[in-house]
């Protein structure tokens, strides 16, 4: 059964992996750029169903192709980091779902713009954070 | 316990910088991403961005992008807000704010000619 | 951006009423909404999270309610030390939006 530590150390690292997603969703509104229209071509594998940590692996194998289409957004207004934001993300990924159970990802047929694909994510974290809380 | 403490109080001329520091004690400072927030004399509270303190990036609200700029220090455990171009609208307090539960006492920046 | 709207801007009340303050997000939010109090040259307190959290060491006559776009702070039974500023904060989505407060003053 899960501890009340490990229970607050999933919840903190959640918390972590929304605020980034956020924070890279927040980036993408704010920017006014004719290379916004590239990035919103991009297509991005969505998972049949998330409602598990384990699924947390379809994000994972989409985080290569999301540091690509954010590595074009890189200007003096958009403050990201890709290499290390994506890094990061990684690191709780893999904290979060482990690395002991392998896990095939299924996908949604339909492929979706990097804004829907964060939201999806966004919308996966805050409601796993709202059963823990 | 979890301290944020910020510098003191600034006169600024319009055009100027400010750069306002938050130190950070009691925790992991990698645990709290940290959000900075403003208040003008009797006004409400505005978010101005937040920094992720273990890699350093951020993410800030549209009205402050290209005159804010926050950074972080880990072998200090602590933040910077850096604002640029003031003007006297820009008057506030600024707070930091780790996780929303725990503030810094605030930092009081007069734009004034 | 998601616009938070309080009402009323402020209140007149004796110590021990009952006080309500609302706060309507212009979208839905689901419950990701926080109360804070502010008094005069003071950082805000966080009171309430997740729109019926209760922050631990907060007196219990405290209480939040709703989900969506429509919520609520109680105070049950007014205290001196509740009258204050109180801000509602929506955490949903970035930009991070604040109501513009409300502020309860001793009748």
């Known amino acids: 059964a899960p501890t009340s530590s490990s229970t607050k150390k999933t919840q903190l690292q959640l918390e972590h992996l929304l605020l980034d997603l956020q924070m890279i969703l927040n980036g993408i509104n704010n920017y006014k750029n004719p290379k916004l229209t590239r990035m919103l071509t991009f297509k991005f594998y969505m998972p049949k169903k998330a409602t598990e940590l384990k699924h947390l692996q379809c994000l994972e194998e989409e985080l290569k192709p999301l540091e690509e289409v954010l590595n074009l957004a890189q200007s003096k207004n958009f403050h990201l980091r890709p290499r290390d934001l994506i890094s990061n993300i990684n690191v709780i990924v893999l904290e979060l779902k482990g690395s002991e159970t392998t896990f095939m990802c299924e996908y949604a047929d339909e492929t979706a713009t990097i804004v829907e694909f964060l939201n999806r994510w966004i919308t996966f974290c805050q409601s796993i954070i709202s059963t823990l809380t | 316990q979890v301290q944020l403490v910020q510098s003191g109080a600034e006169v600024k001329k319009p055009g100027a910088s400010v750069k306002v520091s938050c130190k950070a004690s009691g925790y992991t400072f990698t645990n709290y991403y940290i959000h900075w927030v403003r208040q003008a004399p009797g006004q409400g509270l505005e978010w101005m961005g937040i920094i992720n303190p273990r890699a350093g990036y951020t993410s800030y609200a549209l009205k402050f992008q290209g005159r804010v700029t926050m950074t972080r220090d880990t072998s200090t455990s602590t933040v910077y807000m850096e604002l640029s171009s003031l003007r006297s609208e820009d008057t506030a307090v600024y707070y930091c704010?780790?996780?929303?539960?725990?503030w810094g006492q605030g930092t009081l920046v007069t734009v004034s000619s | 951006d998601i616009q938070m709207t309080q009402s009323p801007s402020s209140l007149s009340a004796s110590v021990g009423d009952r006080v309500t303050i609302t706060c309507r997000a212009s979208?839905?939010?689901?419950?990701?909404l926080a109360w804070y109090q502010q008094k005069p040259g003071k950082a805000p307190k966080l009171l309430i999270y997740?729109?019926?959290s209760l922050q631990s060491g907060v007196p219990s006559r405290f209480s939040g309610s709703g989900s969506g776009t429509d919520f609520t702070l109680t105070i049950s039974s007014l205290q001196p030390e509740d009258f204050a500023t109180y801000y509602c904060q929506q955490s949903f989505t970035m930009p991070i939006t604040f109501g513009q407060g409300t502020r309860l003053e001793i009748k």
């Open positions: 704010a780790g996780g929303w539960l725990d």
């Open positions: 997740a729109a019926s």
């Open positions: 979208q839905s939010i689901s419950s990701w």
